[in-house]
Interface confidence: low
Amino acid sequence: NQDLPVIKCVLINHKNNDSSVGKSSSYPMVSESPEDLGCALRPQSSGTVYEAAAVEVDVSASITLQVLVDAPGNISCLWVFKHSSLNCQPHFDLQNRGVVSMVILKMTETQAGEYLLFIQSEATNYTILFTVSIRNTLLYTLRRPYFRKMENQDALVCISESVPEPIVEWVLCDSQGESCKEESPAVVKKEEKVLHELFGTDIRCCARNELGRECTRLFTIDLNQTPQTTLPQLFLKVGEPLWIRCKAVHVNHGFGLTWELENKALEEGNYFEMSTYSTNRTMIRILFAFVSSVARNDTGYYTCSSSKHPSQSALVTIVEKGFINATNSSEDYEIDQYEEFCFSVRFKAYPQIRCTWTFSRKSFPCEQKGLDNGYSISKFCNHKHQPGEYIFHAENDDAQFTKMFTLNIRRKPQVLAEASASQASCFSDGYPLPSWTWKKCSDKSPNCTEEITEGVWNRKANRKVFGQWVSSSTLNMSEAIKGFLVKCCAYNSLGTSCETILLNSPGPFPFIQDN
């Protein structure tokens, strides 16, 4: 049919942090290159029906379905989803094509289904069908890796029972502390399941698939390092494998290592030793203690002893279920407008947590850092001095934890005024919450010093906008003040701010800001 317009259907995927996308804006913010959905004419259908390629979306993803129409003249349109009509606002791009968009924010099951777009142009009417479904990741899993000894070899196998099968990599580092951060030049990555080089300072195994990345560190006691002030602690759940490595370096091979649990030697078959000469001809020995599936009675102090080094211990605690230990009482903070400040949560958890910081319905990435005492800490500094409620949420396989923070920013009040026929009201969001005064301006009091106390009603903290308190004061109008100028002033420890209002008969009220 020669009259049929040229139709292009595209899918725009928005990055998760794209908070600028509106509910069904005609001008969505493009975050990634649009994907062509084809839009072919559907054969054997009554009327002109175009069908876009099916769209599969991850849960919580944000997308835009967009149609570009190359047809002369104006177009009008209507979206229909699950028998409900949705607003449709076409606009024209630089090439004079009609553009119609449907934005779906944070995809959920309820938003999956058929979206019908009816378009009426001067030449013809036609329908465009989009089918949107949620990508089925229910069967997908990503489990933390664990270690096994390779049969008949001095090597460790890293296993992550995940679907789809993850890519497994060993992350090795031979220097101390900060320089073993993931992107440091001291870090070497080996994408294989078996590791033979087990003498390094820091050994981790990571598994990654479509769901993300999980890592497990090989717990190590280094007899050449000064012991930590608090005893290192290792948590495991019943049934998980236990691996502890004891490492020691000496000038020659004349030393041995042994493992004890609560002063009793570990049973044969629960340890194996390896040794090598380092570049400077010193001898490195490592002794692994392992239990293929731990039980409650494997809890206790594991001590590695050497004939040439002071012994060191670690406390292994076997738990039935994972946990997150932290104080969940809410915390309030009061800071100056330019003061540097970070929220922080100190916690002990097993398995490792996944966490987010949330403010004003927006989520922020959460970083966690291990402390020497077995605790971890997460800090959030990106508050940009916005007052309100901040939420820290953490979870692992077995536990959830939420902690609330309120941030108050100390500042001088800012006053806004409004008036009606019967009253005048002033609002302020300064902090600490301001006190109010009302003054009358008259011939007797040209400087507005005559205080009004009758008919004043103060409401402190009457509404909470994401934790931000607003204070208000209302003056009921009496005959004594009708027709006069009145001044409302809000003051706190940081200053005063006033507004002047003319109380005349009903109608628009002039306000004079007066700081």
Partner: nanobody, 111 residues
């Protein structure tokens, strides 16, 4: 270095069957899991099935019952048996071991 080669694709009528093969070179075959994926025109690559080194199998729920994954470690080959094929099964099918992918084999199901 692992190299993978899929074969067995082709044109088949709806309701028919095909058996895809994934031949691997390299010594790591028996130690690793094998995944099959597929990619239909204009769509993202999607996971189909998996077989672990121990022979345990997992399937995309909507395909379970029609597709069967198996492996023969002696031949360094994995298989995907596809029965009761539908037009929506039309795609390029790929196998994967670790981070290694094959070139893919085209399966077209006509109605």
């Amino acid at each position: 270095q692992v190299q993978l080669q899929e074969s067995g694709g082709g044109l088949v009528q709806a309701g028919g069957s095909l058996r895809l093969s994934c031949a691997a070179s390299g010594s790591t075959f028996s130690r690793n899991y094998i995944d099959w994926y597929r990619q239909a025109p204009g769509k993202q690559r999607e996971w189909v099935a998996q077989i672990t080194s121990g022979g345990n199998t997992h399937y995309e729920p909507s395909l379970k019952g029609r597709f069967t994954i198996s492996r023969d470690n002696a031949k360094n080959t994995a298989y995907l048996q596809m029965n009761s094929l539908k037009p929506e099964d039309t795609a390029v099918y790929y196998c994967r071991i670790l981070d290694y992918w094959g070139q893919g084999t085209q399966v077209t199901v006509s109605s």
